[in-house]
């Protein structure tokens, strides 16, 4: 399916708008510290190229390829080398090499200021002094910060964020309805940055059979009623689209999720009776709504997995035959039967059933070796059951803030080295899964659970990858991505870890702490306890609760001084030189 | 040109109900709210409510609350506004108006297109 | 509810006068206020919006000042056009919109 020009092509299927949009996207994700006006002259200037491209595909430079054309456009930003230091070296490879370089470059923790949320009646003028401009804008830093995140789901996004500026703008109470909608978009949008990020990861890291794998997984827990071949040919598409959006090439991206909406549309009664309301709707709707769509109902009568799985003569002679599909058909058939387990435990079924194969079907007699193959199964399942009942019969005794806490010193004694903001972003995520998940019944809970957890560590992992610091952690991220949930689990006190200096600097406060909100104070107070447990890694479970119990009455009550910076300054030495007597430090 | 046609003058009798329309034009209809106004005979403007355009949300004067009922059809970019039971006290000419937006870091409201204007005459 | 005062109620003036209008709140209402201009048997039109900016296509001697309780209209040189009744309106409580009673400006 050539064409003589790739960026006609594009721009014709896809349409100015989304285009610009992808292209704008794109840029944004590389370089990410390049002023918005920077970006929006270059997008502005490939769209001109673009549309010379589909006046005349022979037209001079239409016949390169994508990763040429914007390498080179992105090549003549002027400051490459004073903002980018050594990416600047990248404009030196020919492509692929050169495209292979900007994705290295790519920065999951870019140096950048928080967003501010400005006033409602600043942001309603902006909006309307200029909507394209402010959409633009808000395309540009979401793809900045987030430089995975799914360009055809970040239009989705941003056709949500507009819909919530046309309607709330001309609400009575403009902040009542636009901040909400804010708030669940910021709070949406993180959470797929990080299902996405754990996807590329999958990709990056580990190679397309272990995508392939936990797609096989996902997708026949979610369309069960769909035949072994059907489900395979979506998992090579979502695959190719995938692997595009994840490797920078977010017009072939959204280009090929647009055919595959297309086509699970048009064959839904193959697929699933739960797509009839998702077909309905727009392309950017229908493609994110298929992507959430609930799972269908198990066929009625499934025969057990023994017969053709332990009990048939042929299981080697099938498996030797072709051993992807035989161990794909393996997890289609257990996904399928299972929507009550997370895809990362049927992953381990699997991997442990290849493994019994691979011993077995050497040895004189296969059948008898592995007959009990399923028995192996139980205490890989038991181990997250259980883990996820002890833990949200805390999360019910504590509470989202307290259970956090407790995940906290639980994650700090794990692995200290780690730096403290990422330790505080990834236990208060951690901590997130108790409201996300206990809720659900005992069928629901294990996928929610575990599938989660997996997207939150593997942000420990990216985070961790930029700068390494502690041997377990990177052992538990490289060593087997189905298993890192348990290799993190199952790490004890970190032993060799020399405490932390104390420092009293660390444990100084002052009055703006009380104009904070919340969840930045909760965040402050999580700081601090991470910081406690660095520099008394042995400290019990008591003595840091009477520590964190006294550091909250002191913010308390010097939030209600009329001297609040002179309380901060006297009560805080007195609560540092207590903390410390109660340490023990 | 941004313009608001309302519907021709009404002559009902007490108890009767009315519907006045309101044709806009020149912009995206769905991007603005819109108010409406009535004038008794002699008298200052009183405020009588107004619709979101984009999700049909309303808000009613109280005085008016259970008789006014205010709608959209975004296909053709009209507003109407219906008041039931009507009184004597109900004459006025009532007008649409466009809810203008937001500038300079303000949302002030300001109504800043209006229609023509509907006499409406409540008599036995 | 809001109650906008306006005062006076009516005002005679001459062509070239300088004339102030003014508004007051029952409470602060910001720069949430807006003034309109009407003619008899026509619809009103903005003036002005968010206390003191000028609406686009109305002449620069209509200026606006004022914020919280007390604002002001003024016409800096009355030209015959210019007679006609004028209110102000706030915006700040979610509805109602209150207007003020009206300012009649009358030819001397």
């Known amino acids: 399916d050539a064409h003589k020009s790739e960026v006609a092509h594009r721009f014709k299927d896809l349409g100015e708008e989304n285009f610009k949009a992808l292209v704008l996207i794109a840029f944004a994700q590389y370089l990410q510290q390049c002023p918005f006006e920077d970006h929006v002259k270059l997008v502005n200037e490939v769209t001109e190229f673009a549309k010379t491209c589909v006046a005349d595909e022979s037209a001079e430079n239409c016949d390169k390829s994508l990763h040429t054309l914007f390498g080179d456009k992105l090549c003549t930003v002027a400051t490459l080398r004073e903002t980018y230091g050594e990416m600047a070296d990248c404009c030196a490879k020919q492509e692929p090499e050169r495209n292979e370089c900007f994705l290295q470059h790519k920065d999951d923790n870019p140096n950048l200021p928080r967003l501010v949320r400005p006033e409602v009646d600043v942001m309603c003028t902006a909006f309307h002094d200029n909507e394209e401009t402010f959409l633009k804008k808000y395309l540009y830093e979401i793809a900045r910060r987030h430089p995975y995140f799914y360009a055809p789901e970040l239009l989705f996004f941003a056709k949500r964020y507009k819909a919530a500026f046309t309607e709330c703008c001309q609400a009575a109470d403009k902040a009542a309805c636009l901040l909400p909608k804010l708030d669940e978009l910021r709070d949406e949008g993180k959470a797929s940055s990080a299902k996405q990020r754990l996807k590329c990861a999958s990709l990056q890291k580990f190679g397309e059979r272990a995508f392939k794998a936990w797609a096989v997984a996902r997708l026949s827990q979610r369309f069960p009623k769909a035949e072994f071949a059907e489900v395979s040919k979506l998992v090579t598409d979502l695959t190719k689209v995938h692997t595009e959006c994840c490797h920078g090439d977010l017009l072939e991206c959204a280009d090929d999720r647009a055919d595959l909406a297309k086509y699970i549309c048009e064959n839904q009664d193959s697929i699933s009776s739960k797509l009839k309301e998702c077909c309905e709707k727009p392309l950017l709707e229908k493609s994110h709504c298929i992507a959430e769509v609930e799972n269908d109902e198990m066929p009625a009568d499934l025969p057990s997995l023994a017969a053709d799985f332990v009990e048939s003569k042929d299981v080697c002679k099938n498996y030797a035959e072709a051993k992807d599909v035989f161990l794909g058909m393996f997890l289609y058939e257990y996904a399928r039967r299972h929507p009550d387990y997370s895809v990362v435990l049927l992953l381990r079924l699997a991997k442990t059933y290849e493994t019994t194969l691979e011993k077995c079907c050497a040895a004189a007699d296969p059948h008898e070796c592995y007959a009990k193959v399923f028995d192996e199964f139980k205490p890989l399942v038991e181990e997250p059951q259980n883990l996820i009942k002890q833990n949200c019969e805390l999360f019910e005794q504590l509470g989202e803030y307290k259970f956090q806490n407790a995940l906290l010193v639980r994650y700090t004694k794990k692995v200290p080295q780690v730096s403290t903001p990422t330790l505080v972003e990834v236990s208060r995520n951690l901590g997130k899964v108790g409201s996300k998940c206990c809720k659900h019944p005992e069928a629901k809970r294990m996928p929610c659970a575990e599938d989660y957890l997996s997207v939150v560590l593997n942000q420990l992992c990216v985070l961790h990858e930029k700068t390494p610091v502690s041997d377990r952690v990177t052992k538990c991220c490289t060593e087997s991505l189905v298993n890192r949930r348990p290799c993190f689990s199952a790490l004890e006190v970190d032993e060799t870890y020399v405490p932390k200096e104390f420092n009293a600097e660390t444990f100084t406060f002052h009055a703006d702490i009380c104009t904070l909100s919340e969840k930045e104070r909760q965040i402050k107070k999580q700081t601090a306890l991470v910081e406690l447990v660095k520099h008394k890694p042995k400290a019990t479970k008591e003595q840091l609760k009477a520590v964190m119990d006294d550091f909250a009455a002191f913010v308390e009550k010097c939030c209600k001084a009329d001297d609040k910076e002179t309380c901060f300054a006297e009560e805080g030495k007195k609560l540092v030189a207590a903390s410390q007597a109660a340490l023990g430090l | 040109e941004v313009q608001l046609l309302q519907s021709g003058a009404e002559v009902k009798e007490p108890g009767a109900s009315v519907k006045v329309s309101c044709k806009a034009s020149?912009?995206?209809?769905?991007?603005?709210?819109i108010s409406w106004v009535r004038q008794a005979p002699g008298q200052g403007l009183e405020w009588v409510g107004r619709?979101?355009?984009?999700?049909?949300?309303?808000g009613y004067a109280q005085r008016l609350q259970g008789r006014v009922t205010m709608t959209t059809d975004t296909s053709t970019s009209i507003a109407y506004m219906e008041v039931r039971s009507l009184r004597s006290d109900d004459t006025a000419v009532y007008y649409c108006?466009?809810?203008?937006?937001?500038?300079?870091?303000?949302?002030?409201?300001?109504?800043?297109?209006w229609g023509q204007g509907t006499m409406v005459t409540v008599s036995s | 509810d809001i109650v906008l005062t306006q005062s006076p109620s009516s005002l005679s003036a001459s062509v070239g006068d300088r004339v102030t209008i003014t508004c007051r709140a029952s409470?602060?209402?910001?720069?949430?206020l807006n003034w309109y201009q009407q003619k008899p048997g026509k619809a009103p039109k903005l003036l002005i919006y968010?206390?003191?900016s000028l609406q686009s296509g109305v002449p620069s001697r209509f200026s606006g000042s004022g914020s919280g309780t007390d604002f002001t209209l003024t016409i800096s040189s009355l030209q015959p056009e210019d007679f006609a009744t004028y209110y102000c309106?706030?915006?700040?409580?979610?509805?109602?919109?209150?207007f003020g009673q009206g300012t009649k400006l009358e030819i001397k």
């Open positions: 108006a466009r809810l203008g937006h937001c500038q300079r870091g303000i949302c002030s409201d300001a109504l800043d297109t």
């Open positions: 020149g912009y995206t209809f769905s991007s603005y709210g």
């Open positions: 619709i979101n355009t984009y999700n049909g949300n309303t």
């Open positions: 409470q602060s209402i910001s720069s949430y």
């Open positions: 968010a206390a003191s």
């Open positions: 309106q706030q915006s700040y409580s979610t509805p109602p919109y209150t």
